[in-house]
Interface confidence: medium
């Protein structure tokens, strides 16, 4: 058998970084090692160019000022999945100060129901619904220097989690037969 | 503007774990953080399930000994969403003993088409695609402690890398109209 | 009981703009596309667009594209088509009909009929 | 656009006698077609519809058939209410189109 690896060791106290340690907002070096890579992860790497197509930001609401698509099946030949999808999406920007990196890109399905092929029309006999992906992130949150329990202006502690990010939409058949 | 975390620091060494510093093969407690929990990400936390119901191991090659199901409402409304969909996909176990998780839940399509919801039964005039994400793991290689070319035996560098995962597959129009 | 009420029938001179409804019950108004239908005097049946009242996506002929407009309230479960300048070969009667729950075009309800009749 | 032709234009047949409808289309629109009924003064009635089922409270004596281009309307035994105009309509390509219409008169 291959060796076991063991689980992540547990870290009861978690170290609080002062303004100094933290250059231009940046989280500790230790959790930002060279091979991390953040850019690579699709979330994050579909930020730039969305930014420069001018997707909006978060905070419109889901579906806001969109609408479900006529799919047209020669305007979408050369298109993307997200676009060539029976229950298509398209992206929006999430942002959160706290959080390394700070800007995620998230998926939003564009139907309640998913496209007929033939037709290229919606129908409600099927549901898109959103597939969600963990991704591990850096949370920072305000912390005390001197052990009160009051924060330190300025300063952070820093962990990793996981969040649910939505990454894209499939097509179902309803839950409910109604 | 919020600050900026600027971009993770890039490290050129690895350092040289020995044997004696890793036991029972796990991976340097740095890298293992209290917070990071892998065990949150969908594709390690489905792991254990897929064992206990016995799925089978990578290797097989894709889609050996599947079958595009005949999708029928009655028997799917209670399903998780992978049986749900129009494009089903099923999990498969990956293993590699050199990366941390070593097993990770991975999805496979289950039919070259999509299902017309109305009939059940598969329909080539769509295609089931899988819906790729990046995951971040760790990665172990041998190497050597005594700065010669040959790796010292039980010892390994590690690094953190994201790889593309596959956790879902969506109904697309085909890229030709063939 | 199913079914699509339309409005009643119009009289009008060539230039002049109208707006024609047919309103659904007695179903999920919001979920069905709405399809409008022309039928010239002593002709066959010809399909015009769609509607999604759910979100108001519009799908047209492209023989009728640029020469109406269909539009839907889905608060009052209604659906329009319209007219900004009438021609005298807009004489018809035009059908709304409810498209089949899996949008293959096939259309299970019909309204009553408006009867438009363009005329100096 | 698909074009579809019926045939005969106009069925002149008795009542009880067996009627036979034909659509002929233009391309290949596989099951999807459907029939429809249109009495004077009223909105047409779906009849049939992919081709061969027949939709809710249509009476047994109507039938479909054909796939491909071809297809049949088969009334089995013409009641007095039949008496009217069939179109057929398909559905395999956007703009959905009908045909010209088939008119079954009393004999």
């Known amino acids: 058998d291959p060796p076991s690896w063991g689980k992540p060791r547990s870290h009861r106290t978690l170290r609080c970084y002062s303004a100094e340690e933290l250059s231009h907002g940046q989280a500790p070096p230790h959790l930002l090692t060279r091979s991390a890579r953040w850019e690579q992860a699709l979330p994050v790497a579909l930020v730039a160019s969305l930014e420069a197509t001018g997707h909006r930001r978060q905070h419109e609401g889901p579906l806001a000022g969109t609408q479900c698509p006529v799919l047209r099946p020669e305007e979408v030949l050369e298109a993307d999945t997200h676009e060539r999808s029976i229950s298509p999406w398209r992206y929006r920007i999430d942002t959160d100060e706290n959080r390394y990196p700070q800007k995620l890109a998230v998926a939003e399905c564009l139907c309640r129901g998913c496209i007929n092929a033939k037709t290229g029309r919606e129908t409600a006999a099927l549901n898109s619904v959103q597939l969600l992906q963990s991704l591990l992130v850096l949370r920072r949150q305000p912390c005390s220097r001197d052990g009160t329990a009051d924060p330190t202006p300025g300063s952070f502690a820093f962990h990793t989690e996981f969040i649910r990010v939505p990454v894209g939409c499939t097509c179902v058949l309803p839950r409910s037969t109604q | 503007d919020p600050p900026s975390w600027g971009k993770p620091r890039s490290h050129r060494t690895l350092r040289c774990y020995s044997a004696e510093e890793l036991s029972h093969g796990q991976a340097p407690p740095h890298l293992l953080t209290r917070s990071a929990r892998w065990e949150q990400a969908l594709p390690v936390a489905l792991v254990a399930s897929l064992e206990a119901t016995g799925h089978r191991r990578q290797h097989e090659g894709p889609l050996a000994g599947t079958q595009c199901p005949v999708l029928r409402p009655e028997e799917v409304l209670e399903a998780d969403t992978h049986e749900r969909s129009i494009s089903p996909w099923r999990y498969r176990i990956d293993t590699d003993e050199n990366r941390y998780p070593q097993k990770l839940a991975v999805a496979e399509c289950l039919c070259r088409g999509c299902i017309n919801a109305k009939t059940g039964r598969e329909t080539a005039a769509l295609n089931s695609v899988q819906l790729l994400q990046s995951l971040l793991v760790l990665r172990r290689q041998p190497c050597s402690r005594d700065g010669t070319a040959d790796p010292t035996p039980g010892s390994f560098a590690f690094h953190t890398e994201f790889i593309r995962v596959p956790v879902g597959c969506t109904c697309v129009l085909p890229r030709s109209t063939q | 009981e199913v079914q699509l009420v339309q409005s009643g029938a119009e009289v009008k001179k060539p230039g002049e703009s109208l707006k024609i409804s047919c309103k659904g019950s007695?179903?999920?108004?919001?979920?069905?596309?709405i399809a409008w239908v022309r039928q010239m005097p002593g002709k066959g049946l010809e399909w015009m667009g769609f509607?999604?009242?759910?979100?108001?996506?519009?799908q047209y002929s492209p023989s009728f594209q640029g020469q109406v407009t269909i539009s839907a309230d889905k608060s009052i479960s209604t659906a329009y088509l319209q007219w900004s300048s009438l021609k005298a070969s807009d004489t018809a009667m035009y059908y709304c009909a409810r498209d089949n729950e899996y949008s293959d075009s096939y259309f299970d309800v019909w309204g009553q009929g408006t009867l438009v009749t363009v005329s100096s | 656009d698909i074009v579809l032709t019926q045939s005969p234009a106009t069925l002149s047949l008795s009542p009880g006698e067996r009627a036979t409808l034909s659509c002929r289309a233009s391309?290949?629109?596989?099951?999807?077609l459907a029939w429809y009924q249109q009495k004077p003064g009223q909105a047409p009635r779906l009849l049939i519809y992919d081709a061969s089922s027949r939709a809710t409270g249509i009476p047994a004596r109507f039938s479909g058939s054909g796939s491909g281009t071809d297809f049949t309307l088969t009334i089995s035994s013409l009641e007095p209410e039949d008496f009217a105009v069939y179109y057929c309509q398909q559905s395999e390509q956007v703009p959905t189109t009908f045909g010209q219409g088939t008119k079954v008169e009393i004999k």
């Open positions: 007695g179903y999920s108004f919001n979920n069905y596309w």
């Open positions: 391309q290949i629109v596989s099951s999807y």
């Open positions: 509607i999604y009242p759910s979100n108001s996506a519009t």
